[in-house]
Amino acid sequence: VPRWRQQWSGPGTTKRFPETVLARCVKYTEIHPEMRHVDCQSVWDAFKGAFISKHPCNITEEDYQPLMKLGTQTVPCNKILLWSRIKDLAHQFTQVQRDMFTLEDTLLGYLADDLTWCGEFNTSKINYQSCPDWRKDCSNNPVSVFWKTVSRRFAEAACDVVHVMLNGSRSKIFDKNSTFGSVEVHNLQPEKVQTLEAWVIHGGREDSRDLCQDPTIKELESIISKRNIQFSCKNIYRPDKFLQCVKNPEDSSCTSEI
């Protein structure tokens, strides 16, 4: 008789999840000499230990502490790029501007990027059928708690000028319910962070509006200012040109507004 299995509203664990995490860890530690000491089998064991045999709606930050410990990594605190709803461009940017880092450029972020995972209470099985959805099922699920934990640490690590890339094509350019709006903004340390600089990325080629005047950006400015951190904002009207100019700053067309 097949055992009854909880049906969640979200997609199940990414196929070949253990192999993917292990392979990513090996690849990352080969590329980043400062992380060569990391034992990837131990990393996988710690990752697995965070959610296996646990109810997938009852995961805590403490469950991830062994993994976080193994994934300790120094990032240049004045070279941090946060993003919200515009991950691909943020990653394209840090691939060119190699001295800047998104969370997914760190080991822990790289391991988990775009993956889903969960287990089942009291069994050692990984659930490949379904996992809890943050809205429809529960917020304390393995994926959400992981990203909340590492995002908090990443924001706490930041200093000097912190940059955030925001999607100007969305109805809420700054969304208080995003990871950036609900976690990272509130964990920037005012004693260390002087300025948060927002880059609002425009979608349409003919869009010449000043999206820094958007009400949600003004809301972000208000939250940041109340935290004793300065705020500045720039429109990136042409993201394609922006990336091109990061690659080739000497290009004569890069002196004009992008």
């Epitope: 990594q73 605190c77 690590a157 004693e191």
Partner: nanobody
Framework: QLQLQESGPGLVKPSETLSLTCTVS??????????WGWIRQPPGKRLEWIGT???????YYNPSLKSRVTISVDTSKNQFSLKLSSVTAADTAVYYC????????????????RGQGTLVTVSS
């Protein structure tokens, strides 16, 4: 709970070397659970990171101070120290030792624990 306490002279003459010590209690300075550093706040200015030392022994220093700074650890006394050479009046500040929890992404500026600070004045 980790506690940190700075000690050292409150007055240093120009061109001399400023030496401060931080005593750690409630945790082992040689534990891989923590990393250690120094920060300072000149009168009327923002906090400034000076440098950091990790469990591995590797050090990171503020580029603007790098040529004058040394941070070291004495595990037998559960202490770490700061030496800042060739001081001028611009080095007058409240100096804080600090500790950070060593997990996940961490910056060079530890901010999880901090001492009460000690005022160092550079004057002849």
């Amino acid at each position: 709970q980790l506690q940190l306490q700075e000690s050292g002279p409150g007055l240093v003459k120009p061109s001399e070397t400023l030496s401060l010590t931080c005593t750690v209690s409630g945790g082992s300075i040689s534990s891989s659970d923590y990393y250690w550093g120094w920060i300072r706040q000149p009168p009327g200015k923002r906090l400034e990171w000076i440098g950091t030392i990790y469990y591995s022994g590797s050090t990171y220093y503020n580029p603007s101070l790098k040529s004058r700074v040394t941070i070291s650890v004495d595990t037998s006394k559960n202490q770490f120290s700061l030496k800042l050479s060739s001081v001028t009046a611009a080095d007058t500040a409240v100096y804080y030792c600090a500790g950070g929890d060593s997990y996940g992404p961490v910056g060079q500026w530890p901010s999880d624990y901090r001492g009460q600070g000690t005022l160092v004045t550079v004057s002849s």
